[in-house]
Interface confidence: low
């Protein structure tokens, strides 16, 4: 009996659905009361999911497996493996017995997108060409480990007096920090760039140093020129700083946040005290760091709805204040295809492919080309539409006449997140029965 | 060498406008801030703010929000001080000066530009 | 503003002898990094001002030796050890710790 599987790894976002294909060739006359199907780890042999005496036998891996019971007697013996954990990584066993028997090891490769990188400089103040400065870039929650690379603004590797550390955190995703440790010349811009080499997905944030004196006030209130990237789920942090004088003490300081454009109150401090959250219970200032400075605000869970300007306000004896963006993303799943028509397919034939990928944020930018990397534009008709939690699911639909054979490939951009996810089918223009897709 | 070259004096009637010009060279005009600084006939020098020559940000001193504008042409290597709405106690010899780059203090100065505001 | 208060007003000093000028600011000038930016510049008759001391008792290249300055918190003094011809002018201590950046009111130097 002859098993197929993919050839190349599933590559599975964790946290959404991955489908692991198998197929087999059922004879005339065959009956699912005939079929033993078995799908187990490859290398420890533990039991996944079955199917045996015509029923199906369920789930042994944490009731997150399922089969595609209305496939099966057409040959589908795919798995359904739902919410992928990264301990999921590894291969899977596909055992299928009628009369016959065979087998097939199907691999399946678990990612995460890495966040857009945080980059800090110490110290941050009063920087005068020659000073050495440290600068960290902060990547969070990918998987698998990243590659990090720093260059200057003209685009030259600084590979010199880089220090990167990648840990683990409980669900096996990486935190990625990065030090580059520099001495400033009359100005510079510095770039990190943290790639996933899994879903070749490159995150990437710069710093411009212009190392001119700004006078500083008695409160000069700092915080990020560029917007704060949050991962929807997760926690921000809106960083706000000022220089306390000496002698200074939490007892003199008002802080407030607040929405820009509203002015809603968000969070304050004030009398000595933290006043609290007043924006649903979701956001905490760092207490024990106000003293040095740090009026920096956590805002947890980040929702889309959270997305725009925060200002933050702080007066001692002075008074000054900064906005800061908070811009929302979400990564895009790898993009599932269809087609249709997808049996006895010739060239000349009209075929619909369709790119579908979900619950991403912003918008995403949908490009097609074929094999050889040729943008396809005409005929493209994409289509985006966001669910109640404001996370967009995007289909993009292509027509396209087939050659003799072609690849067809959707890449979906999240473009403030720089991640391309991207599928492809590749058609035969010989008779042929595209495999259903599970 | 390091030169500060302002434009010529200027006679000027109340509510007009004026537009002091500092041509730098001998450095790299971008790595180093300006600023202002102002005379009056018989006083002292009072500080009216500088400009990031890098990013184009003016900061003002208190006194002179409003009606004084810095500004640049990075091209030429020039920055600009204008006056609107002239004043008698305008009058007064308005100076460019470099900001070293480390200690923060004015290495260099223009020659001074003397504004005459009379009717 | 901080208000920086020189004295003595006028300084006449006889050629070879030393001479001292004292300048008092209304707060301190040590900067939140620990640094003091407290300067000295001269302004020469119908000249531009010219920068002399920086940071207290740095001396700015080309300044004879005969130019110190010191103190600190609040407290600064420029001495000339021997006073030459060439050094009338006005004299104007300045801050640059806190913005505005501000100037005191100047210690005219003539010669006797």
């Known amino acids: 009996l002859e098993v197929q599987v993919p050839e190349d790894p599933v590559v599975a976002l964790v946290g959404t659905d991955a489908t692991l294909c198998c197929s087999f060739s059922p004879e005339p006359g065959f009956s699912l009361a005939q079929l033993n199907l078995i799908w187990q780890l490859t290398d420890t042999k533990q039991l996944v999911h079955s199917f045996a005496e015509g029923q199906d036998q369920g789930s042994a891996y944490a009731n997150r497996t399922a089969l595609f019971p209305d496939l099966l007697a057409q040959g589908n013996a795919s798995l359904r493996l739902q919410r992928v954990r990264v301990a999921d990584e590894g291969s899977f066993t596909c055992f299928v017995s009628i009369r016959d028997f065979g087998s097939a090891a199907v691999s399946l490769q678990v990612a995460a997108p890495y966040s857009k990188p945080s980059m800090t400089l110490e110290p941050n103040k009063d920087l005068r060409p020659g000073d050495t400065v440290t600068i960290t870039c902060s990547s969070y929650q990918g998987y698998p480990e990243a590659e990090v690379f720093w260059q200057d603004g003209q685009g030259v590797p600084l590979t010199g007096n880089v220090t990167t550390s990648q840990m683990a955190n409980e669900q096996g995703l990486f935190d990625v920090h990065s030090i580059l440790r520099v001495v400033l010349g009359a100005n510079g811009t510095y770039s990190c760039l943290v790639r996933n080499p899994v879903l070749q997905q490159d995150a990437h944030s710069s710093v411009t140093i212009t190392p001119q004196r700004s006078p500083t006030g008695a409160v000069e209130v700092q915080v990020p020129e560029d917007p704060v990237v949050a991962l929807v789920g997760t926690d921000a942090t809106l960083r706000c700083s000022f220089s306390p004088e000496p002698g200074f003490s939490l007892a003199q300081l008002n802080l407030i946040w607040q929405l820009t454009d509203t002015k809603q109150l968000v969070h304050s401090f004030t009398e000595g005290r933290d006043q609290g959250s007043a924006y649903a219970n979701r956001t905490a200032l760092f207490p024990d760091l106000l003293a040095q400075g740090n009026a920096s605000l956590r805002l947890q869970r980040v929702r889309v709805a959270d997305e725009g300007s925060f200002t933050c306000f702080v007066s001692i004896r002075d008074f000054g204040s900064a906005a800061v963006s908070l811009q929302v993303a979400a990564p895009y799943s790898k993009p599932s295809m269809t087609l249709e028509p997808n049996k006895d397919l010739r060239p000349g034939d009209t075929v619909t492919i369709t790119c579908s990928s979900y619950r991403g944020y912003p918008e995403a930018e949908v490009f097609w080309q074929d094999g050889q990397g040729v943008p396809l534009t005409g005929n493209v008709t994409t289509s985006q539409m966001a669910n109640e939690q404001g996370l967009f699911d995007v289909h993009s639909v292509l027509r396209v006449v087939l050659g003799a054979n072609g690849t067809y490939s959707c890449l979906v951009r999240n473009p403030v997140l720089q991640q391309d996810a991207h599928g492809s089918v590749t058609i035969t223009g010989q008779p042929m029965t595209f495999p259903p897709e599970a | 060498q390091v030169q500060l070259v302002q434009s010529g004096s200027e006679l000027k009637k109340p509510g007009a406008s004026v537009k002091v010009s500092c041509k730098a060279s001998?450095?790299?005009?971008?790595?180093?801030?300006l600023n202002w600084v102002r005379q009056a006939p018989g006083q002292g020098l009072e500080w009216m703010g500088w400009?990031?020559?890098?990013?184009?940000?003016?900061t003002y001193a208190e006194d002179f929000k409003g009606r004084f504008v810095f500004s640049l042409d990075t091209s030429v290597s020039t920055a600009y001080l204008q006056i609107s709405s002239l004043k008698a106690e305008d009058t007064a010899v308005y100076y460019c000066?470099?900001?070293?780059?480390?200690?923060?203090?004015?290495?260099?100065w223009g020659q001074g530009t003397t504004v005459t505001v009379s009717s | 503003d901080i208000v920086m208060t020189q004295s003595p007003l006028s300084l006449p000093v006889t050629p070879g002898e030393p001479a001292s000028i004292s300048c008092r600011s209304s707060?301190?000038?040590?900067?939140?990094?620990?640094?003091?930016?407290l300067h000295w510049y001269l302004q020469k008759p119908g000249q531009s001002p010219q920068l002399l001391i920086y940071?207290?008792?740095n001396r700015f290249s080309g300044v004879p030796d005969r130019f110190s300055g010191s103190g600190s918190g609040t407290d600064f003094t420029l001495k000339i050890s021997r006073v030459e011809a060439e050094d009338v002018g006005v004299y104007y201590c300045?801050?640059?710790?806190?913005?505005?950046?501000?100037f005191g009111g100047g210690t005219k130097l003539e010669i006797k």
């Open positions: 000066a470099r900001d070293d780059g480390y200690y923060y203090t004015m290495d260099y």
């Open positions: 300045s801050q640059s710790t806190h913005v505005p950046w501000t």
């Open positions: 001998g450095y790299t005009f971008t790595n180093l801030g």
């Open positions: 707060q301190s000038l040590v900067h939140s990094n620990g640094k003091t930016y």
């Open positions: 400009i990031n020559t890098a990013g184009g940000q003016p």
């Open positions: 940071k207290v008792s």
